[in-house]
Amino acid sequence: KLTIESTPFNVAEGKEVLLLVHNLPQHLFGYSWYKGERVDGNRQIIGYVIGTQQATPGPAYSGREIIYPNASLLIQNIIQNDTGFYTLHVIKSDLVNEEATGQFRVYPELPKPSISSNNSKPVEDKDAVAFTCEPETQDATYLWWVNNQSLPVSPRLQLSNGNRTLTLFNVTRNDTASYKCETQNPVSARRSDSVILNVLYGPDAPTISPLNTSYRSGENLNLSCHAASNPPAQYSWFVNGTFQQSTQELFIPNITVNNSGSYTCQAHNSDTGLNRTTVTTITVYAEPPKPFITSNNSNPVEDEDAVALTCEPEIQNTTYLWWVNNQSLPVSPRLQLSNDNRTLTLLSVTRNDVGPYECGIQNELSVDHSDPVILNVLYGPDDPTISPSYTYYRPGVNLSLSCHAASNPPAQYSWLIDGNIQQHTQELFISNITEKNSGLYTCQANNSASGHSRTTVKTITVSAELPKPSISSNNSKPVEDKDAVAFTCEPEAQNTTYLWWVNGQSLPVSPRLQLSNGNRTLTLFNVTRNDARAYVCGIQNSVSANRSDPVTLDVLYGPDTPIISPPDSSYLSGANLNLSCHSASNPSPQYSWRINGIPQQHTQVLFIAKITPNNNGTYACFVSNLATGRNNSIVKSITVSASGTSPGLSAGA
């Protein structure tokens, strides 16, 4: 079926529209376009004869139409009057006619709107404001935005006049915002510049600061007044009802007891005509002056400088007191007090000496404290730490390294890759890394005050595949029943599974075995000699699986209670005595012998030829393990009988 499609359907004035013909029959004689919904010779736009390829304008032709061989009609430079229906009349070769109708609508391009207001300075809780979006345009939709958000739901907000007018009833200071209106039609949308609503309000009840009302004679009184107000309030001060000055701050130096009284702040808003007041009562006491601390060095360098803090003023027959971190002074060889306690010296300051420090002057009734003083100890930079600790990254991820070194003032950071300076930032970010980003990453931390620099170098490897892992241990020779051992599978890599085996078996369930750090660390608590086994770690990621070489744990143990062999205790005179001592121990223990408490030789075997009854007594074997620091011993009684006096005696070795 012959159809007409308008592209576009909604057309902006001045633009063009194409009436596109679908399913045009074959074997045509010609066709004509007409304005309207029917064929009317008076409203013919253009005709076209296929045989001659001749286009003939009709009465409705405006010079803006172009007809194409496929019968489609292009109308250029569209005007409002072009809106409506268009009919295509097709004459086939057999002179049978066919018709189809299409339509489009014309809309103007909207101008940029503006906002008019009936009240430029509304008063809070009193006035209403009506915003109107200009100009008024037919077939346009109006929208409103407050702080670039759509209108909130509120009973105080009302849209009228086809949404062209936005009314805010009983304005509040929170209505101070950016307002925009927007006009839309099917072919355009335009937004106005923002209008800021200036709501007059206040003054609220003023606040007087500081809040404290008790002062010492000789101090300065500095009171500040503030009241929320638009436009800003004008301030006046009254003391005991007498006007003093029209300022926001009231300053009276070196006050006396006579300055005690009621202090009133009055806030006035000239636009709203409102006044508000607040009263505070000030009491001045006659007391000694407040102490303060002076320092001979405001920026001491760690491990280099000493600092002397002195409590001022110097007053005869006065007791001076000191506090550090709100505690009395700790006992330390680095803290020294002068004879009168007025000067506190810190020798060779450290970063932990920042304080705060306070001194006090004791009088009859109380202790007056100074303001706290904090020392600005310059230190560092320490060796920088690069995080995260991964050394392997897979291609395609983002590399984000952060460097931190303890330092005061804060360190300035630089990054180098393979020795080439990259940037002077604390963080280094490289997106979508490849194998080419493998290399030595150096973070340099510099302290501008001390002039010191420290660097840390990290090797980064970018590879889909992980390397053969290795096991690091925090304790290569742990002591039985005492030490813990933490095995860590290296390297640390993202998106990696870590696995462990002991003697080729998966980990046994034991309360002494603990996996942590994403299974990368295996901790054995309270090791025993049975833990001396082969430990293997494995790593697995998306493309690779690999195992470490085994690490055998060397557990130090013993010495256990020794055993003396042979077990015989009775010998015949003339026999040889050959005693051997053995104790389970790692490493092998040192042996020594005592006979009747007298030290003998430092050997594992004790040999005495041709014993006699004089060799009767106690034979003690002593074992010591220098590695574990442990000792053990056993005592055996030996009886030697005269030859032939007792049957069943050992003949000895």
Partner: antibody
Framework: EVQLVESGGGLVQPGGSLRLSCAAS????????MHWVRQAPGKGLEWIGW????????EYDPKFQGRATMSADTSKNTAYLQMNSLRAEDTAVYYC?????????????WGQGTLVTVSS | DIQLTQSPSSLSASVGDRVTITCSAS?????MHWFQQKPGKAPKLWIY???NLASGVPSRFSGSGSGTDYTLTISSLQPEDFATYYC?????????FGQGTKVEIK
Amino acid sequence: EVQLVESGGGLVQPGGSLRLSCAASGFNIKDNYMHWVRQAPGKGLEWIGWIDPENGDTEYDPKFQGRATMSADTSKNTAYLQMNSLRAEDTAVYYCNIITMATPYPMDYWGQGTLVTVSS
Amino acid sequence: DIQLTQSPSSLSASVGDRVTITCSASTSVIYMHWFQQKPGKAPKLWIYSTSNLASGVPSRFSGSGSGTDYTLTISSLQPEDFATYYCQQRSSYPLTFGQGTKVEIK
């Protein structure tokens, strides 16, 4: 015993699609990355990509990006490879494969392969 | 992409011969892995991480190399060793295989 069994191969028209399955037994596919590799008749091995069945993360050879889609159903312990817009040169045996450290030694397990023939 | 070039593409050898297959990478890789494939069968991991024999692989096989040049060696060829051998790199995406080396009976 670890086993991977592929299915879903067969004759496909040019321009058509196929969905291959790789059913795993003897292990949980959530714990391993599943790779797909293909081999055209008489030709070498060609890596297509991998999927992490636990979270659906994937990595493709760029030449298959857009035409191949890997997925997994952990409840069925099965991984899938969908190939679209098939051409004659996609005729190959398709294998699924895992690389694992389930024992103290790296192991590589492969399916038996499923033949896909693209022809009109 | 990292290209892997195996040589030779095929070789004929007798039982007992020493056979060496090389694999050259266009860019340095961490490790090379080797697979054995027999006709109609899936490939089998044969040597992993350059020099480690996979489970069940006879000790007459060995692997070596670093950087861009890697080698698979069979010290004394046995009848069951006749197959096609592929090298594979997993250092860089996409993972790539060599074109294969077919070991045939002379």
